[in-house]
């Protein structure tokens, strides 16, 4: 959490941002809140990015003002206009690109004063893994697949029964570049699995961590997966 204050003493307002991560090719949100004002027409929101000449986005007098917007953000940004009055200056960002990563500043002016806070925005690719029994294999084998990751993640297998066991010798992981030549498909195969056990395929890079679980018994197969973004710090 980053909390910023205006520079001029009594004319300062609190602005709060939260570091976040964007999934390239998808839409993202850069979070920013501020002390609300009672008049929308008195609120100015400016989003800036370190190293970028033009603005990322500007909202003033109750509407967008994009005359100074940098070309790289053209047609890709919006604030939640109906929520500005309650102090929400968060920015919607369409079709997140690797180059969108960096330090952003949320700068606010209201009738109470000014304030700003920085936000670190990471970009990469992350997706939910799916673990299945590979019936084509000669022995009992599990196959863990996740369609989109970047940067290249690590893949670790774990088991409920053999906690702490190292499965690197009985697993094989490959990374296949997707058609857009940035993200990669992750495929990991675990050999010599036993039934009545729960196995976990954990995929992690510096942006996200995802886990796919599979429980194999004689009568059924149960699957579960979840994904968690790393380093969501507020400012």
């Amino acid at each position: 959490l980053i909390i910023g204050f205006g520079i001029s003493g009594r004319h300062s307002i609190t602005v709060t941002t939260v570091a976040s991560a964007g999934n390239i090719g998808e839409d993202g949100i850069l979070s920013c809140t501020f002390e609300p004002d009672i008049k929308l027409s008195d609120i100015v929101i400016q989003w800036l990015k370190e190293g970028v000449l033009g603005l990322v986005h500007e909202f003033k007098e109750g509407k967008d003002e994009l005359s100074e917007q940098d070309e790289m953000f053209r047609g890709r940004t919006a604030v939640f206009a109906d929520q500005v009055i309650v102090g929400n200056a968060s920015l919607r960002l369409k079709n997140v690109q690797l180059t969108d990563a960096g330090t952003y500043k949320c700068y606010i002016i209201t009738s109470k004063g000014k304030g700003n806070a920085n936000l670190e925005y990471k970009t990469g690719a992350f997706s939910m893994p799916e673990v299945n029994v590979d019936y084509n294999a000669s022995s009992e084998t599990l196959r863990c697949e996740a369609p989109r990751w970047f940067p290249q993640p690590t893949v670790v297998w774990a088991s409920q029964v053999d906690q702490g066991a190292n499965f690197s010798e009985v697993s094989n992981t490959s990374f296949e570049l997707n058609s857009e030549n940035v993200t990669m498909k992750v495929v990991s195969v675990l050999y010599n699995v036993t039934i009545n056990n729960t196995y976990s395929c954990m995929i992690e890079n510096d942006i996200a961590k995802a886990t796919g679980d599979i429980k194999v018994t004689e009568s059924e197969i149960k699957r579960r997966s979840h994904l968690q973004l790393l380093n969501s710090k507020a400012s």
Epitope: G25, E26, D64, L66, S67, K94, N95
Partner: antibody, heavy 120, light 107 residues
Framework: QLQLQESGPGLVKPSETLSLTCTVS??????????WGWIRQPPGKGLEWIGN???????YYNPSLRSRVTISVDTSKNQFSLKLSSVTAADTAVYYC????????????WGQGTLVTVSS | EIVMTQSPATLSVSPGERATLSCRAS??????LAWYQQKPGQAPRLLIY???TRATGIPARFSGSGSGTEFTLTISSLQSEDFAVYYC?????????FGGGTKVEIK
């Protein structure tokens, strides 16, 4: 409510420049949350996005037409214009102007369209 | 550029029946998709944006769904005024592109 109206010659000779103007009424072209776009539709075919302009004059063009297209704006007249140079018969189409959201980027409303025929 | 493919090209439906139109993108467009209706001699009219949000004044019988690469426009009970050509449009990345259209005709 906001209305858009295209105007310009309905017949253009091959190799010449097609020029159309879109007049916006019922609202200001300087409304900050919108771009102003051109879309065309050859007879019996689908829609092709040509490009857009912001009231400040910044433009973005479809790469397939970029070398031949110029879009300009006149805020004092509440108008924006399209010029397409070196036209051929393949440029024969109904040309529409439309308001384009800054994001989401949907087109609404549209002008009624004007048919431009390229023929000698 | 992103290629949008609509199917079927023509859909024959009786009034009062449900119509389901499909639109597929050559790569993910997230939810950055709009649907338009066009009647002969008229300009297209916005129906849906954001894949599922109805535009102002559009009847509830029109609904949109999908995300990524697969999208659907559903007309729950076709009225006589709904027979037209329908286009999908992606605005995920420049250049914005339209599908080839689906003509909904009276059966």
């Amino acid at each position: 409510q906001l209305q858009l109206q295209e105007s310009g010659p309905g017949l253009v000779k091959p190799s010449e420049t097609l020029s159309l103007t879109c007049t916006v009424s019922g609202g200001s072209i300087k409304s900050g949350s919108y771009y102003w776009g051109w879309i065309r539709q050859p007879p019996g075919k689908g829609l092709e996005w040509i490009g857009n302009i912001y009231y400040s004059g910044s433009t973005y063009y479809n790469p397939s037409l970029r070398s031949r297209v110029t879009i300009s704006v006149d805020t004092s007249k509440n108008q924006f214009s399209l010029k397409l140079s070196s036209v051929t018969a393949a440029d024969t189409a109904v040309y529409y102007c439309a308001r384009e959201g800054s994001y989401p980027n949907q087109f609404d409303p549209w002008g009624q369209g004007t048919l431009v025929t390229v023929s000698s | 550029e992103i290629v949008m493919t609509q199917s079927p090209a023509t859909l024959s439906v009786s009034p009062g029946e449900r119509a389901t139109l499909s639109c597929r993108a050559s790569q993910s467009v997230s939810s950055n998709l709009a649907w338009y209706q066009q009647k002969p001699g008229q300009a297209p009219r916005l129906l849906i944006y954001g894949a599922s949000t109805r535009a102002t004044g559009i009847p509830a019988r029109f609904s949109g769904s999908g995300s990524g690469t697969e999208f659907t426009l559903t007309i729950s009970s076709l009225q006589s005024e709904d027979f037209a050509v329908y286009y999908c449009q992606q605005y995920h990345s420049f250049p914005f592109t339209f599908g080839g259209g689906t003509k909904v005709e009276i059966k």
